[in-house]
Amino acid sequence: LEVQVPEDPVVALVGTDATLCCSFSPEPGFSLAQLNLIWQLTDTKQLVHSFAEGQDQGSAYANRTALFPDLLAQGNASLRLQRVRVADEGSFTCFVSIRDFGSAAVSLQVAAPYSKPSMTLEPNKDLRPGDTVTITCSSYQGYPEAEVFWQDGQGVPLTGNVTTSQMANEQGLFDVHSILRVVLGANGTYSCLVRNPVLQQDAHSSVTITPQRSPTGAVEVQVPEDPVVALVGTDATLRCSFSPEPGFSLAQLNLIWQLTDTKQLVHSFTEGRDQGSAYANRTALFPDLLAQGNASLRLQRVRVADEGSFTCFVSIRDFGSAAVSLQVA
């Protein structure tokens, strides 16, 4: 007996009703008294619904299933599943027996749209260029797990310094929290996009941060135009300098060196203190020269993997940055 079901999964939204289609071809003279129909969970073999001895035997699955009794005689053995829950997701097998026997399995894919993300900033006031800000994007009550993407105002993906967590509630729906850490530039737009991979539904929110600028204008940060060439195993100095104003003290200085592309932290000086190397303990500043505006970085025992662009961020009252390339030979 040939039993037919859809090849593709049946996608159903949480809380709605779903029809799991199943059909067979009745022979001439077929009567329902001859029909044995069983729906069961494919993996556990748990009975879901049955029709036998000419009668609907009812739901064995939380009283949320029904057949289409008026259509059975025409070969329609479909099952209606009401008020779909996340726990219903999976494979259902439709067994049909008349004189002969056939079966086929249909997949139910459950989905729930994610809410429009809400965005929060920490800190959220008195922001200045050079400050590190944590932006949190939260979206709720979706299923299955989301894909989360961050972009800047021109659509450039922001992939570094992102942490995403997804927690299921009692109903199995996910709440998504994604955190992006950024060093503020002059101003910037940050967008968070939460994508439901089953529904192909994109929910997005943006925040534009315009830091306060001091009247003096940006800090001018200077680096060499040409790449710094260093031999493998030797030490390299990535030069970076700024012009301190009269009365400048190191307590005012925030200095961050990071990899330009990935934004990975390399070395920092904040709150009047050298915060040390975040890069394999092979970097050092020139502490005695910082007060004169020398923010250069020493990179020890250069490796091939060090090659690339390093950005020097300097923030005093205002902010400036510049990138220097390291070429390894």
């Epitope: 800047d152 450039v156 192909q200 994109d202 997005h204 990138a323």
Partner: antibody, heavy 122, light 107 residues
């Protein structure tokens, strides 16, 4: 009208670097991101990366990480791409392209440069 | 990465005919697909984005359809200037990826 004018062809030796440029006219340079695309016989079209023309923020196709470096000069409305440690596999036409995105995670290209042919040969 | 399979790689037709080019994605990409035309000595031209949205200035004989994984570019009543190379590109996610191209030649 919108134009992306790329620098001329380059014939370079293996192992060296080359920097190609893309000068924009007909729209405000910093209004949208710039992408770079490689066209070779072996691999057809390959997306290299994207740069924010305002902030300089970049994102690279992992395949081109370490090979390509994108930069911009806002004062001259020019985007640059440097290709390092060239080999024969880098011989190709390189295009700059103005990206368009609409709240999705991806972009399409409304305008293209005419392409820069890079030939790597000893 | 999303792989894009474009077919056919080569196509011959005559002016006035209708042709169809197909692109298939290795995973569902909703309707995030663009089509381009490439001609020697000219800059690449965007024809269609988001599966079926015609770029301004492109003649209506070009149309795009499809969603999820299967997409088509249809050119009806071919004009002499339509003989060119055509590429599709997914703009669903990074890295952006292209089909291998279809060369449309005069029969």
């Amino acid at each position: 009208q919108v134009q992306l004018q790329q620098s001329g062809p380059e014939l370079v030796r293996p192992g060296v670097s080359v920097k190609i440029s893309c000068k924009v006219s007909g729209y405000t340079f910093t209004d949208g991101a710039m992408h770079w695309v490689k066209r070779s016989h072996a691999k057809s079209l390959e997306w290299i990366g994207i740069i924010n023309t305002n902030s300089g923020n970049t994102n690279y196709n992992q395949k081109f990480q370490g090979k390509a470096t994108m930069t911009v000069d806002k004062s001259s409305s020019t985007a640059y791409m440097e290709l390092a440690r060239l080999t024969s596999e880098d011989s190709a036409i390189y295009y700059c392209a103005r990206g368009v995105f609409y709240y999705g995670y991806g972009a399409w290209f409304a305008y293209w440069g005419q392409g820069t042919l890079v030939t790597v040969s000893a | 990465d999303v792989q894009i399979t474009q077919s056919p790689s080569y196509l011959t037709a005559s002016p006035g005919e209708t042709i169809i080019i197909n692109c298939r994605a290795s995973k569902t990409i909703s309707n995030y697909l663009a089509w381009y035309q490439e001609k020697p000595g000219k800059t690449n031209k965007l024809l269609i984005y988001s599966g079926s949205t015609l770029q301004s200035g492109i003649p209506s004989r070009f149309s795009g359809s499809g969603s999820d994984t299967d997409f088509t570019l249809t050119i009806s009543s071919l004009e002499p200037e339509d003989f060119a190379m055509y590429y599709c590109q997914q703009h669903h996610e990074y890295p952006l990826t292209f089909g291998a191209g279809t060369k449309l030649e005069l029969k």
